[in-house]
Amino acid sequence: VPRWRQQWSGPGTTKRFPETVLARCVKYTEIHPEMRHVDCQSVWDAFKGAFISKHPCNITEEDYQPLMKLGTQTVPCNKILLWSRIKDLAHQFTQVQRDMFTLEDTLLGYLADDLTWCGEFNTSKINYQSCPDWRKDCSNNPVSVFWKTVSRRFAEAACDVVHVMLNGSRSKIFDKNSTFGSVEVHNLQPEKVQTLEAWVIHGGREDSRDLCQDPTIKELESIISKRNIQFSCKNIYRPDKFLQCVKNPEDSSCTSEI
């Protein structure tokens, strides 16, 4: 008799999830020799321990604490780039500007980027059929809790000037419900962080509006100011040009307004 299995609304665990996490870990330690001594099998064991045999709607930050013990990777605290709804450009930027880091440039972020995972209560099986959707099923699912935990720690580690890339093409350029708006903003430490600098990325080629005046940006400024952190904002009118100028800052066409 086939055993009854909970059907969730979201996609199931990414296929070959254990192999993917292990392979990513090994690759990361090869790319980042400062992490050469990390034992990726132990990392996977801790990752697995956070969600295997646990109800996928009952995951807590505590479940990830063993894995977070590895999260002491020393990213320069003044070189942190946060992002919201514009991941690809943020990652393209840090690939060029190698001394700046998004969460996905750290080991834990790199391991989990774009993956889905969940287990089942009281069995050691990984659920490849379906996993809880944040809206339709529950927010305390393995993936959401993971990102909330690592995002909080990443924001807490930041210092000096913190940059955030925001998508100017969205109706809410700053969204209070995004990970940035609900977790990272509130975990920047005022005693360490002097300024949050927002980069608003324009989508349209002919879009010359000052999106730093957008009501949601003003809302972000208000939240940040109340936390005793200074706020500044820049329009990035031409993201393609922006990246090109990061690659070749000496280019004569690279003026301050991009």
């Epitope: 020799p33 050469r36 001594h37 034992d39 002491t72 020393t74």
Partner: antibody, heavy 118, light 110 residues
């Protein structure tokens, strides 16, 4: 084959300075992390400092941070340890070691003795 | 006081199996590779085991390493007189941002 030869050890008074050198051969020196490890008389091994390849990043044990400086000269295939504000407890044999791809110390020199005494 | 804990001594007769333990924490052994070194007085230390259980070429298969959780062990089977030496475990420690060694175990062949 791989050879690591330390030099520069000797007797120095407390508060004094000394510079150790390690001449490397038999491998592509610039490719590898390098380290200094010491052993005080009658004691165990103690890691002192490491320096990365490429644009060098340095790492130090708490016991020497701020007093010792590790550096390298890839053109000369040489590793150095500048030791300032020396204390009696720094008395030890100092080994130069090459690190492997997984962080292990694959090759070691024969060591040079540093004695800090008045 | 070493961050990694080893027994001060271990002994066995020729041909016997001796095991040396090394106990640490999640900030070192837990998430990092364990290395084992053999040190004979007056000589340079020698790498015996890396990545928990890998032997460099030239190290006899009588030496084997293992790791479980926050602990590791080195086993020497078919003990020989030339195995008399000090043995050290080591690992990277995240909280110290550096390598840590065990206090060393003196192996005696009776």
């Amino acid at each position: 084959q791989v050879q690591l030869v330390e030099s520069g050890g000797g007797l120095v008074k407390p508060g004094g300075s000394l510079r150790l050198s390690c001449a490397a051969s038999g491998f592509t020196f610039s490719d590898d992390y390098m380290s200094w490890i010491r052993q005080a008389p009658g004691k165990g091994l103690e890691w002192v400092a490491s320096v990365s390849n490429g644009r060098p990043t340095t790492y130090y044990a708490d016991s020497v941070r701020g007093r010792f400086t590790i550096s390298r000269d890839n053109a000369k295939n040489s590793l150095y340890l500048q030791m300032n504000s020396l204390r009696a407890e720094d008395t030890a044999v100092y080994y130069c070691a090459r690190e492997g791809w997984s962080g292990e110390f694959t090759d070691w020199g024969q060591g040079t003795l540093v004695t800090v005494s008045s | 006081q070493s961050v990694l804990t080893q027994p001060p001594s271990a002994s066995g007769t020729s041909g016997q199996r001796v095991t040396i333990s090394c106990s640490g924490s999640s900030s070192n052994i837990g998430f990092h590779f364990v290395y084992w070194y053999q040190h004979l007085p007056g000589t340079a230390p020698k790498l015996l085991i890396y990545k928990n259980n890998q032997r460099p070429s030239g190290v006899p298969d009588r030496f084997s390493g293992s790791k479980s959780g926050n602990s590791a062990s080195l086993a020497i089977s078919g003990l020989r007189s030339e195995d008399e030496a000090d043995y050290y475990c080591a690992a990277w420690d995240d909280s110290l941002s550096g390598y840590v060694f065990g206090s060393g175990t003196k192996v005696t062949v009776l």
